[in-house]
Interface confidence: medium
């Protein structure tokens, strides 16, 4: 709305940088062939690039990434009893970000 | 995978708490009747609840919210020239979070 401007602070752009995000650990990251198990923890923190850039036709993208293996519990339910196993999930952390030109294909004339 | 366990640290649950997220300011928040304008900045930071809870049938939800009006530029293109106006967008910040029981309807037998 265009009203009640007095109380409003000027909006500040969310700059393009890494921020902490929550990553849901889906079961198919661990085992695509079996659905009869649970994963713990169900979610972890990752660092990801987000935010906006100062001009159009550019997007906030990761310029440096790091793969980070973490150990999770794979909890298989066998005859109503849990069996605990370790599994490794590889997370992707963004270490640095940049505003990168997005190449949009020109229409053929 | 179940391999390469040695190098992996145990995964730590992303606890239910407020984190900084990026909110895209869509044009229809400002004017639903007209598409012939731009908004600046296109995105801002907000505080939002995210993460997982330690037990089943619960979800991370905001327990306290605050509405925060911010001033943005509405840039209308009139006869190929920009006309700058001010507009107010009300953002929702989460101040506190809690793990709240999710009531799942029991199947009727």
């Amino acid at each position: 709305s265009l009203g009640s401007l007095a109380a409003a602070e000027p909006a500040v752009i969310a700059e393009c940088k890494t921020r902490t995000e929550v990553f849901q650990i889906s079961r198919n990251l661990i085992d695509r062939t079996n659905a009869n198990f649970l994963v713990w923890p169900p979610c972890v923190e990752v660092q990801r690039c987000s935010g906006c850039c100062n001009n159009r036709n550019v997007q906030c993208r990761a310029s440096q990434v790091q793969m980070r293996p973490v150990q999770v519990r794979k909890i298989e339910i066998v005859r109503k009893k849990p069996v605990f196993k370790k599994a490794t999930v590889t997370l992707e952390d963004h270490l640095a970000c940049k505003c990168e030109t997005v190449v949009t294909p020109r229409p053929v004339t | 995978s179940l391999g390469s366990l040695a190098a992996a640290e145990p995964a730590v649950i992303a606890e239910c708490k407020t984190r900084t997220e990026v909110f895209q300011i869509s044009r229809n928040l400002i004017d639903r009747t007209n598409a012939n304008f731009l908004v600046w900045p296109p995105c801002v930071e907000v505080q939002r609840c995210s993460g997982c809870c330690n037990n089943r049938n619960v979800q991370c939800r905001a327990s306290q919210v605050q509405m925060r009006p911010v001033q943005v530029r509405k840039i209308e293109i009139v006869r190929k020239k920009p006309v700058f106006k001010k507009a107010t967008v009300t953002l929702e910040d989460h101040l506190a979070c809690k793990c709240e029981t999710v009531v799942t309807p029991r199947p009727v037998t």
């Epitope: 109503k80 849990p82 069996v83 196993k85 370790k86 | 145990p10 330690n54 037990n55 089943r56």
Partner: antibody
């Protein structure tokens, strides 16, 4: 204060029965798995039985299977261990213990224990 | 049934490092926890999930687990660390405890 308080121990004859209770306070009992662990005099720890947060998963050590039954009443914040056909080798201090998750995990809180003596 | 094997006793001088081992078949595939028990007291969790320390447990306690062996390490051992230590793992539908190790702090 977060605590677990066992009760119901005592002297019982071989073949007899006892029901142990564990009263939980200071945390949301219904959200966590619980276990019973015992320790015979001068011996090490022996896991006895486990129950998940809602009671849907239960399992037992081979040494007590068919004789002991674990249960919980989440409305009363209480864990139980029904012990039947008791034997001399069941003599031990019985601890109830809390897991940090609904499914289990480590035992992060222990009660003070209650002594069960099986003797004629 | 699955077994966890610990040495019955370990001795260490004050200020030195004590290492207590726990061995079992493919133990590194499971999460190992360590409990401390002092005479007449209930057990206390000192390490969980191989290497994590609960709040309130001193930094001198650490853990590792790979292959067939998990190890509890106490660096700069103090007299107050004298106790029985038990390893534990959840395997094959049951929680298994090691036989326990009596740690003696000499002097």
């Amino acid at each position: 204060e977060v605590q677990l308080l066992e009760s119901g121990g005592g002297l019982v004859q071989p073949g007899g029965s006892l029901r142990l209770s564990c009263a939980a306070s200071g945390f949301t009992f219904s959200s966590y798995a619980m276990s019973w662990v015992r320790q015979a005099p001068g011996k090490g720890l022996e896991w006895v039985s486990y129950i998940s947060d809602d009671g849907s998963l239960k399992y037992y050590a081979d040494s007590v299977k068919g004789r002991f039954t674990i249960s919980r009443d989440n409305s009363k914040n209480t864990l139980y261990l029904q012990m039947n056909s008791l034997r001399a080798e069941d003599t031990a201090v019985y601890y109830c213990a809390k897991h940090p998750y609904w499914y289990g995990g480590q035992l992060d809180l222990w009660g003070q224990g209650t002594l069960v003596t099986v003797s004629s | 049934s699955y077994e966890l094997t610990q040495p019955p006793s370990v001795s260490v001088s004050p200020g030195q490092t004590a290492s207590i081992t726990c061995s079992g078949d493919s133990l590194g595939s499971y999460f190992v926890h360590w409990y401390q028990q002092k005479p007449g007291q209930s057990p206390v969790l000192v390490i969980y999930d191989d290497s994590n320390r609960p709040s309130g447990i001193p930094e001198r306690f650490s853990g590792s687990n790979s292959g067939n062996t998990a190890t509890l390490t106490i660096s700069g051992t103090q007299a107050m660390d004298e106790a029985d230590y038990y390893c534990s793992a959840f395997t094959h539908n049951s929680d298994v405890f090691g036989g326990g190790t009596k740690l003696t702090v000499l002097g």
